[in-house]
């Protein structure tokens, strides 16, 4: 039997076994959070499963997700919520530690989703493991970037209270307009909700003792926020190993001086 | 003395070009957002163009998308508007103008005037 | 046509109060930043209220509300000198543009 024609795309394809992957997880997380123990991961995986398969993997929308969204519902306490750009581990280690704080990925789907890959093919119920398109060189709608997208707009529409944002302050863009937090979650922030926004700069050299929330980009983010009527501060985190220890342990004595 | 001066306006013919300048004094322009905003004979006041803080990003109102350049030197304190393609319905007052977060165009010049006729 | 809907006119007699309406949508007034400016007749514009408070050098008899997609200014004590139009103005998210109100001209009798 010849093998059937199948699309070429430049990015890696389905993470192997992302069905089971997708299932344990679920079932993990909603064991974990009694708060979302109602959840049929059955459904869930039905609702993940039909945003994407038989679906050409260029032409998907966020409607495609809207009903893995509605089973995925969650809400986060106000002051509560933690977003970040280009430095994903160190706020997951943050949220780890401060248990009462939330990052996309210690909600449902973000945790569901989290470093995976997933593609259909038109036509077919079959799920893509040698290649998915690549966001630059094949299509932004694909159906990772557009689930991203998704969750982030409602992670950020959520949010209430003070926001807080960890922003990497080695990059040379240290708020870049074109990462999710900078087209996505910044735009979707509910100013009727959100008092402030927050941003948690940083810093990776250790002897870098400037003031990186002068930085031309972080005064651009502060432009964005101020159109939009939230209020913008901004702290600079000179040591981030000691940061995060003293999140671990605040009554240390060296915890009393500045991180 | 806080102060923006623009500079470049003219009469030029439809289809023709022309380069805005405003020169910044008096406060860090390197610091906020610029605003190109217009306002033609006996009307009220238009958007034309925005450009963030390092211009890496602009903005520009539909009817001059395509024709019409905002840039910045921050080395000079100097905006740009680089007007192509000028049309009769761009005959206006220019004005270039700041944005100071949270409050909004607070420093604006005495504007130059452009006509375009024929 | 302006995205943000303004009177074109309005009067007053010296001493009097007037207010100043500006309509808008969900995706400027409703969730952002209102400005009013004020041009006196010859002159660029004058920034006179930022989200309903003064900027410093401005007045007090000029004030600034917002309620919904609706802003407005009010002028109480009016005077010969504030007869000129005024210009109301928001960030707008869908379009990714400043839009202004089509200008109101207040007229002192």
């Known amino acids: 039997v010849l093998p059937r024609w199948r699309q070429q795309w430049s990015g890696s394809g389905t993470t192997s076994r992302f069905p089971e992957t997708v299932l344990a997880r679920c079932v993990k997380y909603t064991e974990v959070h009694p708060e979302m123990r109602h959840v049929d991961c059955q459904s869930v995986w039905d609702a993940f499963k039909g945003a994407f398969i038989s679906k050409y993997p260029c032409n998907i929308t966020e409607e495609d997700y809207q009903p893995l969204v509605k089973l995925g519902t969650q809400t986060v306490p106000c002051n509560k919520t933690l977003l970040w750009s280009r430095i994903k581990d160190l706020a997951h280690q943050f949220t780890q530690v401060q248990r009462d704080m939330f990052t996309l990925e210690d909600m449902l789907l973000g945790y569901l989703a989290d470093d995976l890959t997933w593609c259909g093919e038109f036509n077919t119920f079959e799920i893509n493991y040698q290649s998915c398109p690549d966001w630059r060189k094949d299509c932004s709608n694909n159906p990772v970037s557009v689930f991203w997208k998704t969750v982030s707009r409602r992670f950020a529409e959520t949010a209430c209270g003070v926001v807080h944002v960890m922003l990497n302050g080695s990059r040379s863009k240290i708020f870049d307009k074109n990462s999710t937090f900078g087209s996505v979650e910044v735009h979707n922030l509910q100013p009727e909700k959100v008092q402030a926004l927050e941003a948690w700069v940083i810093h990776g050299g250790r002897e870098d003792s400037r003031d990186l929330c002068q930085d031309p980009t972080i005064k651009e983010l502060e432009s964005i926020i101020s159109k939009r009527n939230i209020r913008f501060f901004c702290k600079n985190i000179y040591r981030p190993d000691k940061f995060l220890q003293c999140v671990k342990n605040p009554e240390d004595s060296s915890c009393l001086s500045g991180i | 003395e806080v102060q923006l001066l623009e500079s470049g306006g003219g009469l030029v013919q439809p289809g023709g070009s022309l380069r805005l300048s405003c020169a910044a004094s008096?406060?860090?322009?390197?610091?906020?957002?610029m605003n190109w905003v217009r306002q033609a004979p006996g009307k009220g006041l238009e958007w034309v163009s925005s450009?963030?803080?390092?211009?890496?990003?602009?903005y520009y109102a539909d009817s001059v998308k395509g024709r019409f350049t905002i840039s910045r030197d921050n080395s000079k304190n100097t905006l740009y508007l680089q007007m192509n393609n000028l049309r009769a319905e761009d005959t206006a007052v220019y004005y270039c103008?700041?944005?100071?977060?949270?409050?909004?165009?607070?420093?604006w010049g005495h504007g130059t005037t452009v006509t375009v006729s024929s | 046509q302006s995205v943000l809907t303004q009177p074109p006119s309005a009067s007053g007699t010296p001493g009097q109060r007037v207010t100043i309406s500006c309509s808008g949508s969900?995706?400027?007034?409703?969730?952002?930043?209102v400005n009013w400016y004020q041009q006196l007749p010859g002159t660029a514009p004058k920034l006179l209220i930022y989200?309903?408070q003064r900027p410093s050098g401005v007045p007090d008899r000029f004030s600034g509300s917002k309620s919904g997609t609706s802003a407005s200014l009010a002028i109480s004590g009016l005077q010969s000198e504030d007869e000129a139009d005024y210009y109301c103005?928001?960030?707008?998210?869908?379009?990714?543009?400043?839009?202004f109100g089509g200008g109101t001209k207040l007229t002192v009798l």
């Open positions: 008096g406060f860090t322009f390197s610091d906020y957002e």
């Open positions: 103005a928001a960030w707008d998210d869908s379009l990714n543009a400043w839009v």
């Open positions: 969900r995706s400027n007034i409703g969730t952002n930043l």
């Open positions: 450009i963030s803080i390092t211009g890496s990003w602009t």
């Open positions: 989200n309903v």
């Open positions: 103008a700041n944005y100071k977060s949270y409050y909004g165009m607070d420093v």
